[in-house]
Interface confidence: low
């Protein structure tokens, strides 16, 4: 009921709490002498459902049968309307529509840790929309039963606050939950379990790792566990990996040797525990331990390549290059590279430690037989040295690979193909494909790239340090014992017409012909490998088509003669450059008049 209901009453039959789909009878009756003053027959009683009028009647009472009420709470209010006055509230009632509780399902109980308390959960089923109480019972040995109640409408969890002990780990316990509301009650199926079934150990703690003699091959993981733990599972992974390695161990007693860790790698370790082989559940994973494994001496050998450059009649420059070892080969932080240069006949050797670079340049005499050895060192030792005899890599013409071609292969890739050398192809021990950005000055500071290819291969895809619209000088070396032959070609992964033409910087007269000199197009404007230059000329003020001379591109060429100009005629000259994609715009225009005599 609501308000004080001084003027009358609202009664609800059969009950204020009804089953969904039931019918209720609502009666509103006025108390004696509470009707309209002087006009009791004029009493008009009105029944509202929330704010909506659903029935009215003249007299002292009103009966209304109501059906189809929704789940939840519905408010009914009875009011009295008299002539020439506002409606007066008489009384009201709330009706609660719901359902009996469904049988609670999937009752399960757990105890977190040997010292924890038993807590159970269940699925309530359909919402009753009514005040419902849940009672949880736990029956154990010796007819002992625990019981606890919660009164939350949405109750689906209860912690008993009691601790099961392992004195009789095989003893059975039975849990049951009962739900009760005004419309009925229902109990779950009983859930029977033992201590071992429901105790979920606490995750292991105090995890440590030790490396005996700072060696990755002698590694032990230590941890602390609750006393009854029988099983552990360990999972570990390199910190940069998503996949775990998993190990199951029995009766580990807080330690386990790990045999397959990689050196110089940060790992993440976690451990979980279980009390019994097939009963109960695993603990949560422990907090992660992160630890870096010790270094080991490098494995593998450096990939070393070199370049020779003639300085003068007695000296040559040797530039050595090598690639970093992979992380798995370096097995630690590489502190330095050791380069040993030796003259094989005289036995003189010089050794140098290189830090921070993967190249080294020195000048040696052109006489003698020279060899180098390069190794990588970390805190634990050095890799096996890579030994190379310094030879003239292109000396053996018969070993030169034939028909070398370089073609674009998708974005930033160049496919280099060749034919074996004429000389017995089976003599080739390996091919080396070398590439570097083409710089007209032949700059030795330009980074060198290379890859090795097996002797039966006749192609290689180069992709490392390849940029679009850049021309690369590509060499293919065939190596056989202490001999080498090479062929070279220019190639690019992507090209377009050059952005500008060559700049003519001088025109000079020489014996009735002219010599045109020009500046190279800046590398960034070449837009790939240049194939040709074109020199155009026409008589000044003439509308005729210009004549042209096409010159194959050569890196070092910066001048060209023309001998078909008429004396004492003023010509306009300009140049363009061509890649496979097309011709550049004009370079600058120059005028020239040949002074020589007519033929």
């Amino acid at each position: 009921k609501i308000d004080a209901c001084k003027r009358g009453d609202v009664t609800v039959k059969p009950s204020h709490v009804i089953l969904l789909g039931s019918t209720v009878n609502i009666t509103c009756s006025l108390k004696p002498r509470q009707g309209c003053f002087h006009y009791s027959r004029r009493n008009k009683l009105i029944l509202y459902k929330f704010d909506r009028r659903i029935n009215f009647h003249h007299g002292h009472s009103l009966n209304s049968q109501v059906t189809g009420l929704p789940l939840g709470t519905t408010l009914f209010v009875c009011k009295l309307a008299c002539i020439n006055s506002d409606e007066i509230q008489i009384c009201g009632a709330e009706i609660f529509v719901g359902v009996a509780p469904e049988q609670p399902q999937n009752l399960s109980c757990i105890q977190k840790g040997e010292q924890g308390t038993v807590a159970c959960t269940w699925e309530r089923g359909r919402d009753t929309h009514l005040y419902t109480e849940y009672t949880l019972q736990l029956s154990g040995p010796k007819n002992l039963t625990w019981q606890k109640q919660c009164k939350d409408i949405y109750c689906d969890y209860l912690d008993f606050g009691i601790n099961l002990t392992p004195e009789s780990p095989e003893s059975n316990f039975t849990a049951k939950v009962t739900a009760v509301n005004s419309l009925g009650s229902s109990s779950s199926l009983p859930s029977t379990f033992t201590f071992l079934d429901i105790v979920r150990p606490l995750p292991p703690w105090d995890i440590r790792i030790k490396f005996q003699k700072a060696s990755v091959s002698r590694c032990t993981l230590y941890w602390r566990d609750e006393g009854l733990v029988l099983l552990n599972r360990l999972r570990y992974r390199p910190s940069n990996s998503r996949l775990w390695n998993m190990v199951n161990v029995t009766k580990a007693k807080g330690r386990h040797d790990l045999l397959d860790l990689k050196p110089f790698t940060e790992y993440e370790f976690q451990i979980s525990s279980k009390l019994h082989l097939y009963k109960g559940s695993w603990s949560d994973w422990s907090e992660s331990l992160r630890a870096q494994t010790p270094e080991e001496e490098p494995t593998g050998m450096l990939d070393v390549w070199y370049m020779k450059r003639h300085i003068d009649y007695s000296r040559q420059q040797i530039s050595l290059f090598w690639k970093n070892l992979s992380v798995s080969e370096a097995r630690g932080k590489i502190l330095h590279y050791q380069v040993t240069l030796q003259e094989l006949t005289g036995g003189k050797a010089m050794t140098q430690n290189i830090t921070g670079h993967t190249s080294w340049t020195t000048v040696i005499p052109r006489t003698g037989n020279w060899a180098v050895a390069v190794s990588a060192a970390n805190s634990k030792g050095s890799s096996l040295p890579t030994r190379i005899n310094i030879m003239n890599l292109c000396e053996a013409g018969l070993l030169a690979p034939r028909q070398v071609s370089a073609n674009s292969e998708g974005m930033d890739n160049i496919l280099v193909t060749w034919q074996p050398p004429r000389k017995d192809p089976s003599a080739v021990q390996e091919y080396v494909v070398e590439w570097r950005e083409l710089h007209p000055g032949g700059d030795t500071q330009v980074p060198l790239n290379w890859l090795r290819s097996r002797p039966y291969n006749v192609s290689a895809l180069i992709s490392e340090n390849i940029k679009s619209y850049i021309c690369y000088e590509i060499r293919v070396y065939a190596l056989s014992g202490d001999q080498g032959g090479c062929s070279s070609i220019l190639g690019n992964s992507k090209h377009k017409a050059p952005l500008s033409g060559p700049h003519i910087n001088a025109i000079t007269e020489e014996k009735g012909s002219i010599l045109i000199s020009w500046n190279s197009i800046p590398v960034q404007e070449q837009m790939g490998c240049l194939l040709h230059y074109r020199i155009y000329w026409k008589e000044r003020d003439s509308n005729s088509q210009p004549q042209l001379c096409e010159i194959p591109y050569r890196v070092s060429q910066n001048s060209h003669p023309i001998n078909s100009l008429q004396p004492r005629v003023t010509y306009v000259l300009w140049m363009t450059a061509l890649t496979a994609a097309g011709e550049s715009s004009h370079g600058n225009e120059r005028e020239f008049c040949l002074q020589g005599k007519a033929n």
């Epitope: 999937n106 959960t121 699925e123 689906d156 999972r235 996949l243 775990w244 998993m246 949560d284 994973w285």
Partner: nanobody
Framework: QVQLVESGGGLVQTGASLRLSCAAS????????MAWFRQAPGKEREFVAH????????TYADSVKGRFTISRGNALNTVYLQMNSLKPEDTAVYYC??????????????????WGKGTLVTISS
């Protein structure tokens, strides 16, 4: 314990469609990663499809990409596998699996905590 019950299998002809359902018990279904695996007679169990707990991320085996679709109805505690353009080589027992603790799982099934008993799908040519 999470219990997984598969249904929807049967015998159909090449090119037909089937929809498998996997009903999962447990209130926290919405936290499980769910997956479908299959095992053809005399062969190893193989991964088919996986869906994250949120349903945002799905992964498929190459052999079923474009033909099968995994989805989930957390409200119904169900994961589905819609299989179209079925081929004879799709014949297998299909298993539903749940990864409850979010650990790494492999396409061989490592890391999956719970498995259904399977439902047989037969594709006749």
């Amino acid at each position: 314990q999470v219990q997984l019950v598969e249904s929807g299998g049967g015998l159909v002809q090449t090119g037909a469609s089937l929809r498998l359902s996997c009903a999962a018990s447990g209130r926290t279904f919405g936290r499980y990663e769910m997956a479908w695996f299959r095992q053809a007679p005399g062969k190893e169990r193989e991964f088919v499809a996986h869906i994250s707990s949120s349903g945002l991320t799905t992964t498929y085996a190459d052999s079923v990409k474009g033909r099968f679709t995994i989805s989930r109805g957390n409200a119904l505690n169900t994961v589905y596998l819609q299989m179209n353009s079925l081929k004879p080589e799709d014949t297998a027992v299909y298993y539903c699996a749940a990864n409850v603790d979010g650990s790494a799982w492999s396409t061989l099934g490592a890391g999956m905590d719970y498995w259904g008993k399977g439902t047989l799908v037969t594709i006749s040519s």
